[in-house]
């Protein structure tokens, strides 16, 4: 861990990020602000329905790179975007959910392609 | 090494404003947020609030959320604190202090009092 | 608000001896990222506060290897295993998991 003056958090980050959440506030969030040591995200995805859900909040940095790298679900149409630039930089973060073809869907899961629009900002 | 420079006193009269200074050095100013607390004379530390100078990104104590206004200048490293319609019950000692996860360094504190 | 309640709030000790103060929560302070965002301060008279433990159990920088802080979820304690003049003073808990950031009361610790 590092003890200097100039970092002291024995984190990548030296300080902490404040994220704008919805749909996914933890109990220690204040007035929809979340608060975390990774990433700030917005994320798309489809309900049960087929019906668009957006999401947003904060990713601890355990973890939050292989999350916001979007890995792709069979058969789950959805898109993550993640920043770290400034507080509560997910707002303005507008991922889309990535375009339905027909062959994703034809062979099964083995062969499934998902398409989707990622922007991983630092 | 980190330094967060702060005047020793201020004595200003009831119903003015005042506003309280915190130089910092020996880091990056932007790296880190600056945190407010005061201290009543033998009373415990109270947390005003909080300012991102990267971004000016401000959080409040909802208790303080009418009194103090909290700015920076990035250029010359200060952190600013503006109280407004002092009473007696603002004479206190005002720290800065910087805040990552947890707070690592206080300026020495402002001591305040308001009298006529 | 999470209230921080330290006890004792003065503890007359010897030199030598071992001090402990405990500082309890009244909600959970570990955080959503898993961290917990509990840390102890000494201020002697007439200064700022220091840093002593970070994130319950990290020592910060300079500090003495006499000062240990355990705890979790709700119960945290700072001990010191044998107290020296310099230790004297006001030690203070903190919390940074729950906005607003809160302080415990302080515990003095004085020469019996």
């Known amino acids: 861990k590092k003890e200097d003056g100039e970092s002291t958090a024995p984190t990548a980050r030296p300080k902490v990020l404040r994220c704008k959440c919805h749909h996914h506030c933890p109990e220690d969030s204040v007035n929809n602000i979340c608060s975390t040591d990774g990433y700030c995200f917005t994320m798309i995805e489809e309900d049960d329905s087929g019906t668009p859900v957006v999401t947003s909040g904060c990713l601890g940095l355990e973890g939050s790179d292989f999350q916001c790298r979007d890995t792709p679900i069979p058969h789950q149409r959805r898109s993550i975007e993640c920043c770290t630039e400034r507080n509560e930089c997910n707002k303005d973060l507008h991922p889309t959910l990535p375009p339905l073809k027909d062959r994703d869907f034809v062979d099964g899961p083995i062969h499934h392609k998902h398409h989707h629009h990622h922007h991983h900002h630092h | 090494q980190v330094q967060l420079q702060q005047p020793g006193a201020e004595l200003v009269k009831p119903g003015a404003s005042v506003k309280l200074s915190c130089k910092a050095s020996?880091?990056?100013?932007?790296?880190?947020?600056m945190q407010w607390v005061k201290q009543r004379p033998g009373q415990g530390l109270e947390w005003i609030g909080e300012?991102?100078?990267?971004?000016?990104?401000?959080l409040y104590n909802q208790k303080f959320k009418d009194k103090a206004t909290l700015t920076v200048d990035t250029s010359s490293s200060t952190a600013y604190m503006q109280l407004s319609s002092l009473t007696s019950e603002d004479s206190a000692v005002y720290y800065c202090?910087?805040?990552?996860?947890?707070?690592?360094?206080w300026g020495q504190g402002t001591t305040l009092t308001v009298s006529s | 608000d999470a209230v921080m309640t330290q006890s004792p709030l003065s503890l007359p000790v010897s030199l030598g001896d071992q001090a402990s103060i405990s500082c309890r929560s009244s909600?959970?302070?570990?955080?959503?990222?898993?961290?917990?965002?509990l840390h102890w301060y000494l201020q002697k008279p007439g200064q700022s506060p220091k840093l002593l433990i970070y994130?319950?159990?990290n020592r910060f920088s300079g500090v003495p290897d006499r000062f240990s802080g355990s705890g979790s979820g709700t119960d945290f304690t700072l001990k010191i295993s044998r107290v020296e003049a310099e230790d004297l003073g006001v030690y203070f808990c903190?919390?940074?998991?729950?906005?607003?950031?809160?302080f415990g009361s302080g515990t003095k610790l004085e020469i019996k």
């Open positions: 202090a910087r805040f990552g996860y947890y707070v690592d360094y």
């Open positions: 020996g880091y990056t100013f932007t790296n880190y947020w």
């Open positions: 300012i991102d100078p990267s971004d000016r990104y401000t």
């Open positions: 909600q959970s302070l570990v955080h959503s990222t898993g961290n917990t965002y």
């Open positions: 994130k319950v159990s």
């Open positions: 903190s919390q940074t998991t729950h906005v607003p950031f809160t």
